[in-house]
Amino acid sequence: KIDTPQRGSIQDINHRVWVLQDQTLIAVPRKDRMSPVTIALISCRHVETLEKDRGNPIYLGLNGLNLCLMCAKVGDQPTLQLKEKDIMDLYNQPEPVKSFLFYHSQSGRNSTFESVAFPGWFIAVSSEGGCPLILTQELGKANTTDFGLTMLF
């Protein structure tokens, strides 16, 4: 088992990158002197106890920042949040921490990230750009759920 997080960079099909702004992740067009976040990701060590056909269950964090992506309900609506959490602490937990887990599916160069806690809800960015990352159930409409993930070695 890999027991250190891998690092990667993410952009969407419109070449927008993820940037941290006031503890919120937003997707913006890449520009000079901009510093996109580097993603830290690690597979759940309890993979045998999660659904096998939805993708690789991973924890997603921001490299070097002790911040991880999680899903929580606000009212009846699943929302995407950044929480102060060490990704390795999540990895080592005795059970999958579903609120922090995403099924990572790859098709060609495209990656999707589906919430384990809220099946059918995917990390997305609004087609308009400059907006926070969200969770959506509506694939391929006003929101983009396909991302390019490039691993950094």
Epitope: E48, T49, L50, E51, K83, N92, Q93, P94, E95, P96, V97, K98, S99
Partner: antibody, heavy 121, light 109 residues
Framework: EVQLQQSGAELVKPGASVKLTCTAS????????IYWVKQRPAQGLEWIGR????????KFDPKFQGKATLTADTSSNTAYLQLSSLTSEDTAVYYC??????????????WGQGTTLTVSS | QAVVTQESALTTSPGETVTLTCRSS?????????ANWVQEKPDHLFTGLIG???NRPPGVPARFSGSLIGDKAALTITGAQTEDEAIYFC?????????FGGGTKLTVL
């Protein structure tokens, strides 16, 4: 109010099987893990295993593999422990407990009142 | 399989601070053992007190705290009360299974 209500005491003959129930109220079992624990007189607690009711996947202490079967019915918010090929060694109190994430850690937070199983001819 | 050892019995007085410990046969207890502490009162009434070594769930009084002391996990009750008289079990995680200690019977006289 979160509660785990377990079925009543059982007196069973050696070699038989028994199915114990644990009915949850105040929360949805799909949102947590249900663990089962065995307590024999003057012998402390033993972890039997767990079920994730959202997908029915189970894990066991190896010594209970083959002895215990864990299932759950999310429509009735109930978890089950089935014990087979019973012997006097299985005489004990069996507890279900919720293993729940609170944002920083998992906890054995709420427990059922226990089911006393007596195996005797 | 690992063996988890606790003091069999301790006695304290109301208002005193008492520390219960939990030792592992495999070596030092670490944060990766995610020590949990559970209280048992008469009539099989169990309550979770501490998870992940030092985290307290909602509703558990602040006088209960968890920590690592030397090579052991510890539960400290600061200002013990008569209603804290109970049996206290620790549980340690060993990568793929939980092992409970034998329990400490705490008397508050």
């Amino acid at each position: 109010e979160v509660q785990l209500q377990q079925s009543g005491a059982e007196l069973v003959k050696p070699g038989a099987s028994v199915k114990l129930t644990c009915t949850a109220s105040g929360f949805n079992i799909k949102d947590t893990y249900i663990y089962w624990v065995k307590q024999r007189p003057a012998q402390g607690l033993e972890w039997i295993g767990r079920i994730d009711p959202a997908n029915a996947y189970t894990k066991f202490d190896p010594k209970f593999q083959g002895k215990a079967t864990l299932t759950a019915d999310t429509s009735s918010n109930t978890a089950y422990l089935q014990l087979s090929s019973l012997t006097s060694e299985d005489t004990a109190v069996y507890y279900c407990t919720r293993f729940h994430w609170y944002g920083s850690s998992f906890f054995f937070d709420y427990w059922g009142q226990g089911t006393t199983l007596t195996v005797s001819s | 399989q690992a063996v988890v050892t606790q003091e069999s019995a301790l006695t304290t007085s109301p208002g005193e601070t008492v520390t219960l410990t939990c030792r592992s046969s495999t070596g030092a207890v670490t944060t990766s053992n995610y020590a949990n502490w559970v209280q048992e009162k008469p009539d099989h009434l169990f309550t979770g007190l501490i998870g992940g070594t030092d985290n307290r769930p909602p509703g558990v009084p602040a006088r209960f705290s968890g920590s690592l002391i030397g090579d052991k996990a510890a539960l400290t009750i600061t200002g013990a009360q008569t209603e804290d008289e109970a049996i206290y079990f620790c549980a340690l995680w060993y990568s793929n299974l939980w092992v409970f200690g034998g329990g400490t019977k705490l008397t508050v006289l």
